[in-house]
Amino acid sequence: SGTTNTVAAYNLTWKSTNFKTILEWEPKPVNQVYTVQISTKSGDWKSKCFYTTDTECDLTDEIVKDVKQTYLARVFSYPAGNVESTGSAGEPLYENSPEFTPYLETNLGQPTIQSFEQVGTKVNVTVEDERTLVRRNNTFLSLRDVFGKDLIYTLYYWKSSSSGKKTAKTNTNEFLIDVDKGENYCFSVQAVIPSRTVNRKSTDSPVECMGQEKGEFREI
């Protein structure tokens, strides 16, 4: 069923990184507009992005209310200029999205190395605790706040003069590694949620190397 001159949305896809969550779909509208609704499995439908000609809708404000809930969205198609028109079943044409559970599925954003400090033969590497759009008590929570013990970081490090990489892991945002005296090292980090089956790892952070201004060197 559906209205004449409208086509149902298709390829509904969730695009989500660090809980910034956008629903995308096709096709680009021709003589039609879209409205999106979102709901939890047990909740009521809430309308967003009313009568839009876009093919995306930012649903972040809804999903951050409870990132552990499972959400479903649907996209309604209406004839442009006649949004009250309904199909033969008395309802506009719509298509359902796949289910989406932000906590289990949001992509982990590319991390950033905040700093590194060398003291003798040890280097402390600190990963920036990136802010998310998840709020509690009117403050934005960090990635570590939200994922807690489920989030680890992997550090890749190597001597500037060679290509052999070593790895270290931490369940905090800091690494303390042993290095050879007098050698410069490069670092890259990756966020990982080992318990996931999808989107387990972020992309690697930009590489930071000793001898550049981000770090600090103290010979003791």
């Epitope: 559970t101 289990l104 709020r135 939200v146 807690g148 996931r196 089956t197």
Partner: antibody, heavy 121, light 109 residues
Framework: QVQLQESGAEVKKPGASVKVSCKAS????????IEWVRQAPGQGLEWMGE????????KYNEKFKGRVTMTRDTSTSTVYMELSSLRSEDTAVYYC??????????????WGQGTLVTVSS | QAVVTQEPSLTVSPGGSVTLTCRSS?????????ANWIQQKPGQGPKTLIS???NRGPWTTARFSGSILGDKAVLTLWGAHAEDEADYYC?????????FGGGTHLTVQ
């Protein structure tokens, strides 16, 4: 509201296995770790392991590795803990628990009522 | 495996305050240990008061608070009531497993 309903008491012989169930309701089953904790008579609490139903990812206490298996059935929102090669010192109340999550917070919050497992010849 | 140590027993007067501590054999307790405090009264199941170091459950009275003091996790009880007499367990997270302390028996008298 969150509820964890455990299966009934069991009496087992040494060397046998026991499978305790924990049926969850009132929340999104896939997203929360379920912990298993036991308490022998007159003793303290002992962590056995945990399972994340959404991915079936598990972590076990080294003490029980090889003897404990945690599984889940997403169609019934039920988690299972199976302990094999039972001995008398496995006599205990077995609890499942779920964390309280509000933006962040990890550990134990909602508890099942406990299942008494008695191992006796 | 790490060992988590608590005072075996403590006594507090009605209306008084008391601090229960939780030490780790591996060094200082940090927020990455996600300290939990669990109360258990005789013949009852466990009830969590604090999780994630300092997060009270909606069922937890404001008379209880959790924090880190120096190198230990602590549970502070203000204005003790007779019904606070119970065993209190601390649990700490170590990268991939939880470890419970032996528990503190709190007497209110």
């Amino acid at each position: 509201q969150v509820q964890l309903q455990e299966s009934g008491a069991e009496v087992k012989k040494p060397g046998a296995s026991v499978k305790v169930s924990c049926k969850a309701s009132g929340y999104t089953f896939s997203s929360y770790w379920i912990e298993w904790v036991r308490q022998a008579p007159g003793q303290g609490l002992e962590w056995m392991g945990e399972i994340l139903p959404g991915s079936a990812s598990t972590k076990y206490n080294e003490k029980f590795k090889g003897r404990v298996t945690m599984t889940r059935d997403t169609s019934t929102s039920t988690v299972y803990m199976e302990l094999s090669s039972l001995r008398s010192e496995d006599t205990a109340v077995y609890y499942c628990a779920r964390d309280y999550y509000y933006g962040s917070s990890y550990g134990f919050a909602y508890w099942g009522q406990g299942t008494l497992v008695t191992v006796s010849s | 495996q790490a060992v988590v140590t608590q005072e075996p027993s403590l006594t507090v007067s009605p209306g008084g305050s008391v601090t229960l501590t939780c030490r780790s054999s591996t060094g200082a307790v940090t927020t990455s240990n996600y300290a939990n405090w669990i109360q258990q009264k005789p013949g009852q199941g466990p009830k969590t008061l604090i999780s994630g170091t300092n997060n009270r459950g909606p069922w937890t009275t404001a008379r209880f608070s959790g924090s880190i003091l120096g190198d230990k996790a602590v549970l502070t009880l203000w204005g003790a009531h007779a019904e606070d007499e119970a065993d209190y367990y601390c649990a700490l997270w170590y990268s991939n497993h939880w470890v419970f302390g032996g528990g503190t028996h709190l007497t209110v008298q």
